[in-house]
Amino acid sequence: LKGQEFAPSHQQVYAPLRADGDKPRAHLTVVRQTPTQHLKNQFPALHWEHELGLAFTKNRMNYTNKFLLIPESGDYFVYSQVTFRGMTSECSEIRQAGRPNKPDSITVVITKVTDSYPEPTQLLMGTKSVCEVGSNWFQPIYLGAMFSLQEGDKLMVNVSDISLVDYTKEDKTFFGAFLL
Amino acid sequence: LKGQEFAPSHQQVYAPLRADGDKPRAHLTVVRQTPTQHLKNQFPALHWEHELGLAFTKNRMNYTNKFLLIPESGDYFVYSQVTFRGMTSECSEIRQAGRPNKPDSITVVITKVTDSYPEPTQLLMGTKSVCEVGSNWFQPIYLGAMFSLQEGDKLMVNVSDISLVDYTKEDKTFFGAFLL
Amino acid sequence: LKGQEFAPSHQQVYAPLRADGDKPRAHLTVVRQTPTQHLKNQFPALHWEHELGLAFTKNRMNYTNKFLLIPESGDYFVYSQVTFRGMTSECSEIRQAGRPNKPDSITVVITKVTDSYPEPTQLLMGTKSVCEVGSNWFQPIYLGAMFSLQEGDKLMVNVSDISLVDYTKEDKTFFGAFLL
């Protein structure tokens, strides 16, 4: 039995033990985004670097087509940071009158897709109004939390506006998960 | 073999197991910064409290001279928050008219230094434009992610402007890492 | 002995091993807050959902009366995000003259209460000035770090103004902890 232990006068069975180095883990980093079709009522998903530089996947945690694939059930810590950058966003009364081309908010969502379930589940959301009065602005949104995930679940990162994502450096925008 | 297990009818060898309480871990907290010389093209590094209050280092994770020293290879979760505080930063059209310098920004970088590699590696960056119109402003930048680190690697936290770091409370500005 | 290992020519005793799936863990999600009395010089504490949706507690980590109860001593990663939303906050010189009903800052504190110690300990603080010039604003504050906690410690999340907390979605405002 995995995790069984011996001592001179007794024998006990414990829950399975496993080496930490064997656990599914991934850290993905930003790449330049190519425009793609996405579902009408869903924010577009980012795609990611999974091998070069700081990025890696290991122990059966795989990345494919914007998704991290969860290879075994358990509790995972999931995190992402997206750095946004844009030009002036007038958000005073003037804007209300009509300046449609300026972002008024930025949003990041970490979403779980389960094939057996029709609707994606939003695990984490970071959303921020943008009312910058300077000539340009930039800022990160960071998210991270623990979730009970099932083998076969898929995770993705959605953003409100892909054109505002800073893809210039791997340390500015990233996405990761690891089994606890 | 570490992690070898026995059961009545078979013997299996697993990857090494280790007690979680033995893993290298550190949580460092802010102290007042003193002006120091640093490399010309690199943001200054913060120094930290490693023993008092909430701060600790354990299991061969040591702190010395602004660096956290990684005592064994593996995947680490690394995090930091820096709270910045400043006075009014005018970044409206007025400034653009006759102040060619860029709008102020605040930046935190978690950097890895490997002695065998000439250039430091930026693991994480949080950077934000500051265009506050009030009489003073304050805000945190939080970072955290998982990285594969090697024994002997050194981690530090660099900031764009040390004079803006809020060092008044240990819960506002901190830096930590733990082996997964 | 827990964690004892065998090899052909020697016998070694290691620190106790334990299955990761047995560790105390919790992820709590926001619910609508009901006005309650709180200590005069302390920010009000949020209460949480601990069973429905994404929320869970497991392995003797219990939630009761706004507190997460720590069931065993060890190093825990503790995190929270609170999303705030409010109406215009004028924070220019105009405000200084007198607009007392607008928030000029938002603060989240993760606090530890130890029954044997009279004063709560602030573990983490995220505090941000709010100087939004638009008609309304919203933004998250995220916190997370590792702490050495003792069996019986209690954790709570305090905020500067409960009426500004966005309780509309479980992915926007949350609180969690897990034994490392």
């Epitope: - | 003193t34 002006p35 930063s89 860029k102 003073n136 040390i162 004079s163 809020d166 008044t168 | -």
Partner: antibody, heavy 117, light 107 residues
Framework: EVQLVESGGGLVQPGGSLRLSCAAS????????MTWVRQAPGKGLEWVSG????????YYADSVKGRFTISRDNSKNTLYLQMNSLRAEDTAVYYC??????????WGQGTLVTVSS | DIQLTQSPSFLSASVGDRVTITCWAS??????LAWYQQKPGKTPKLLIY???TLQSGVPSRFSGSGSGTDFTLTISSLQPEDFATYYC?????????FGGGTKVEIK
């Protein structure tokens, strides 16, 4: 070791101009905010002006706004205070200082500015 | 502007005395307050920052307390080298302001 050395003080007539300099050494100048503080003879301390590390933000006391300009040249590790339209009440010892969120830590030895006809 | 009012303006004391100087802010400044010591012909020296934290190298007989609008500098046992002028200063908002000073003289 942090060192701040002011220069440029002297006697000037009312309405005249003067430029003070503060040479910094022993720390990476561009990463730190700097400030000017003055002290009239026999009087208390008065904050005059400040500048952020990269020079993006400047701040002034009402008494000097529009007349004084603070600037810095990070390539020369030098802080400046350009003082125009000087008045008798500007007579003081002018100190430059390193500035963080809760104090003025390191101070120069000061340079005396005398405005008199 | 935030006014800082120091009290007393002058103080006569003897070596070994416990001395307390107060600084009152016209509006709340959290703990963004510093205390300085200045001797004649010398530059000011930082004693206390963030209202209550002792600057490195400053003797432990100096202490600071307070938050919001009321602040105190205490010298637990006055020494000969402590006869000087003491200033408080706020860092909460512009313009940065100093108190008027408290001159501590030998009785």
């Amino acid at each position: 070791e942090v060192q701040l050395v002011e220069s440029g003080g002297g006697l000037v007539q009312p309405g005249g101009s003067l430029r003070l300099s503060c040479a910094a050494s022993g720390f990476t100048f561009s990463s730190y905010a700097m400030t000017w503080v003055r002290q009239a003879p026999g009087k208390g301390l008065e904050w005059v002006s400040g500048v952020s590390g990269r020079g993006g933000s400047t701040y002034y006391a009402d008494s000097v706004k529009g007349r004084f300009t603070i600037s810095r040249d990070n390539s020369k590790n030098t802080l400046y205070l350009q003082m125009n339209s000087l008045r008798a009440e500007d007579t003081a010892v002018y100190y430059c200082a390193y500035w963080d969120i809760s104090s003025f830590d390191y101070w120069g030895q000061g340079t005396l500015v005398t405005v008199s006809s | 502007d935030i006014q800082l009012t120091q009290s007393p303006s002058f103080l006569s004391a003897s070596v070994g005395d416990r001395v307390t100087i107060t600084c009152w802010a016209s509006q709340g400044i959290s703990t963004y307050l510093a205390w300085y010591q200045q001797k004649p012909g010398k530059t000011p020296k930082l004693l206390i920052y963030a209202a209550s934290t002792l600057q490195s190298g400053v003797p432990s007989r100096f202490s600071g307390s307070g938050s919001g609008t009321d602040f105190t500098l205490t010298i637990s046992s006055l020494q000969p080298e402590d006869f000087a002028t003491y200033y408080c200063q706020q860092f909460n908002s512009y313009p940065l302001t100093f108190g008027g000073g408290t001159k501590v003289e030998i009785k």
